[in-house]
């Protein structure tokens, strides 16, 4: 990796846990998004692989509420509204960073956690395994 | 209100920026995900709304690499491989938290940032606006 020169204006971290523990400014900066972005609109209803959104809530985590997508069908919805089981609805997953208080109940000490969330669904051609 | 005793096991934050600046442990805990999860497999190729993954790299950000989905077509791919322009390929977007070095180049000082990323694409029925 590239060695970053120690900037004299940087906070000092001669902590025994450094560099595992860093200082983080919690005043969130919004990049490329308005304060109140429209979240993927109504795609969950209009998609050929529609999904439902389920609330995953944990008050000890930030964000406390995460909406998880669950595909409605095994197959994909055709133009006539029927489900085509020759195709598959599958979840698109992404790893996201969340904050968790650690030690618990400490007001100003946190740990980053990575969780895998389903964001929506897409329609794919199935992988067919031929038996010899 | 009930006074919460300051937990002796909590880090001390007599920092002039406290309490906007807090300590965060970067030794990331993976919850419900392996260290190297398969990223939504090869769905980007097999989807009826296929997408390309573009590498968005920024050494001042954590994670420094984020993969952005760009839908390949305006329409959706039919079983015969042709594109159906009566349907739309659209990106599924999600807001995620990242850490940005602040001040720049400081190895142990960050700011929380919210960015909007495209995770994949899904095929939707278009909204048709009828002109009176």
């Amino acid at each position: 990796g590239i060695a970053i020169p120690r900037n004299s204006g940087c906070p000092n971290s001669e902590d025994k846990n450094f560099p595992r523990t860093v200082m983080v400014n919690l005043n969130i900066h919004n990049r490329n998004t308005s304060t109140n972005p429209k979240r993927s609109s109504d795609y969950y209803n209009r998609s050929t692989s529609p999904w439902n959104l389920h609330r995953n809530e944990d008050p000890e985590r930030y964000p406390s509420v995460i909406w998880e997508a669950k595909c409605r069908h095994l197959g994909c919805v055709k133009a006539d509204g029927n489900v085509d089981y020759h195709m598959n609805s599958v979840p698109i997953q992404q790893e996201i960073l969340v904050l968790r208080r650690e030690p618990r109940h400490c007001p100003n000490s946190f740990r980053l956690e990575k969780i895998l969330v389903s964001v929506g669904c897409t329609c794919v051609t199935p992988i067919v395994h031929h038996v010899a | 209100g009930i006074a919460i005793p300051r937990n002796s096991g909590c880090p001390n934050s007599e920092d002039k920026n406290f309490p906007r600046t807090v300590m965060v442990n970067l030794n990331i805990h993976n919850r419900n995900t392996s260290t190297n999860p398969k990223r939504s497999s090869d769905y980007y190729n097999r989807s009826t709304s296929p997408w390309n993954l573009h590498r968005n790299e920024d050494p001042e950000r954590y994670p420094s690499v984020i993969w952005e989905a760009k839908c390949r077509h305006l329409g959706c791919v039919k079983a015969d491989g042709n594109v159906d322009y009566h349907m739309n390929s659209v990106p599924i977007q999600q807001e995620i938290l990242v850490l940005r070095r602040e001040p720049r180049h400081c190895p142990n000082s960050f700011r929380l940032e919210k960015i909007l990323v495209s995770v994949g694409c899904t095929c939707v029925t278009p909204i048709v606006h009828h002109v009176a």
Epitope: L26, N27, I28, T35, N36, P37, K38, R39, S40, S41, D42, Y44, N45, W51, N52, L53, R55, E57, D58, P59, Y62, P63, S64, V65, I66, W67, R101, H105, C106, P107 | I2, I4, P19, R20, E95, L97, K114
Partner: antibody
Framework: QVQLQQSGPGLVKPSQTLSLTCAIS??????????WGWIRQSPGRGLEWLGR?????????DYAVSVKSRITINPDTSKNQFSLQLNSVTPEDTAVYYC??????????????WGQGTLVTVSS | DIVLTQSPATLSLSPGERATLSCRAS???????LAWYQQKPGQAPRLLIY???NRATGVPARFSGSGSGTDFTLTISSLEPEDFATYYC??????????FGQGTKVEIK
Amino acid sequence: QVQLQQSGPGLVKPSQTLSLTCAISGDSVSSSSAAWGWIRQSPGRGLEWLGRISYRSKWYNDYAVSVKSRITINPDTSKNQFSLQLNSVTPEDTAVYYCAREVDSLYYSYFDIWGQGTLVTVSS
Amino acid sequence: DIVLTQSPATLSLSPGERATLSCRASQNVWAFYLAWYQQKPGQAPRLLIYGASNRATGVPARFSGSGSGTDFTLTISSLEPEDFATYYCTQYYSSPSLTFGQGTKVEIK
């Protein structure tokens, strides 16, 4: 811009049902980035959150524990409005009732738009 | 439920003075979900600060918020005549818990 217009009776008899409506303009009750709530204010109780509805592929309801057994908040998508029903009211339910839009972007939660308020008196 | 306790109940100050309002939670809350509102007699509350420290659209720079954990502060750097009102803090912890403080009235001395 977004506006909320409240309507409903200002006087309700004890044991009856309090019904208020909040009409939305400039946004949709089915918005996936907002929740729609009711808050009341009385001299004795101060500001008290009563409940909210939000749409995320289906309707979600959250109600304050203090009124959970008596409250219903319903959307009306055809009229782009939502309503509050509070059953079995008593004089303690006398208050100014506000409807409000709650920005619900995962990362923040706050009421940015409020209705004008409706004073509801419970009295025989 | 989490209890939010605001202090002082009343703050008597003159225009131009600095006002410091406190909001204390009965247990740790996420600063991101803490907001401050201003209310004048006969009016609905108006959003001032969200996420503990972010000014809402159109709110003058003399208003600032800070805090984390259990202790939060709203500061008005130099009081203007239109700032004399009642201020409320509120927090969202988890469904169905959304609570308001009892308010701090800022009155002209």
